[in-house]
């Protein structure tokens, strides 16, 4: 079959990297300069795409691939093939329409992006409050209050805090 | 056509001021938020300032409060960069881009060229 068609189609000659020029009886031409073909066969190469102002270039174009863009420092990507550029903030706020916003009291954010979320509630699985959260920390849950009474041999390890919510990334 | 055209940039000393000016055409200015970014010598490309839709401001760098400002005249489609005691580490291309919302860039929103301000004695 591939064979057939190569008689009948002699752009599936064509390999990635350049295109089937109609203008020269279907020979395989190269991409022009900033344009590429990631397949073969192609009839035309495709424009690279351009990591401008906030988008900086993370792989460069070549004739066979596009460019790949990331984010310059004080941003993330969002999107697919980070079509996006989003604003960081600091830890122990969140991105409202208004800009970086404190996280509510408690509520807290450990990292750059997403949404403040609420302090885990220790006393829902038996347990107290070992540390104090903050608007950038989550609260460390302790033993539950009884295993505090005195007398106690031990003080058994701080549980895992639990996810109290997902912030969409 | 869309444009963006930055203006104003030039040799300043330390401790002077500078007025950018960015000038758009093509597009409907009022819906649009314009923010300003440098690029120094040999380093990553930062955010310095950017003006919602509304004339809110948005600080992209710690470095500049107090010393720079930002404003937009809707009537002339013109945003300005107002620069003050400006540091040599300052010096580098300015350049403006207009995306929807100061906080999110798009792939296909606008960039100017760039204008250059060197700060040094």
């Known amino acids: 079959f591939e064979r057939t068609r190569s008689l009948q189609d002699p752009c599936s000659n064509c390999p990635a990297g350049t295109f089937c020029d109609n203008n020269r009886n279907q020979i395989c031409s190269p991409c022009p300069p900033n344009s590429f073909s990631s397949a073969g066969g192609q009839r035309t190469c495709d424009i690279c795409r351009q990591c401008k102002g906030v988008f900086r270039t993370r792989k460069e174009c070549s004739s066979t691939s596009n460019a790949e863009c990331d984010c310059t420092p004080g941003f993330h990507c969002l999107g697919a093939g980070c079509s996006m550029c989003e604003q960081d903030c600091k830890q122990g706020q969140e991105l409202t329409k208004k800009g970086c916003k404190d996280c509510c009291f408690g509520t807290f954010n450990d990292q750059k992006r997403g949404i403040c979320r609420p302090w885990t509630n220790c006393s829902l699985d038996g347990k107290s409050v070992l540390v104090n959260g903050t608007k950038e920390r989550d609260v460390v849950c302790g033993p539950s209050p009884a295993d505090l009474s005195p007398g106690a041999s031990s003080v058994t390890p701080p549980a895992p805090a639990r996810e109290p919510g997902h912030s969409p990334q | 056509q869309v444009q963006l055209q930055e203006s104003g940039g030039g040799l300043v000393e330390p401790g002077g001021s500078l007025r950018l000016s960015c000038a758009a055409s093509?597009?409907?200015?009022?819906?649009?938020?314009i923010g300003w970014f440098r690029q120094a010598p040999g380093k990553e490309r930062e955010g310095v300032l950017c003006i919602s839709s509304s004339g809110g401001s948005t600080y992209y760098a710690d470095s500049v409060k107090g010393r720079f400002t930002i404003s937009r005249d809707n009537a002339k489609n013109t945003v300005y960069l107002q620069m003050t005691n400006l540091k040599p580490e300052d010096t580098a291309v300015y350049l403006c881009?207009?995306?929807?919302?100061?906080?999110?860039?798009?792939?296909?929103?606008?960039w100017g060229p760039g204008t250059q301000v060197t700060v040094s004695s």
């Open positions: 093509g597009f409907t200015f009022d819906d649009y938020a």
């Open positions: 881009g207009a995306p929807r919302d100061c906080s999110r860039y798009s792939s296909d929103d606008y």
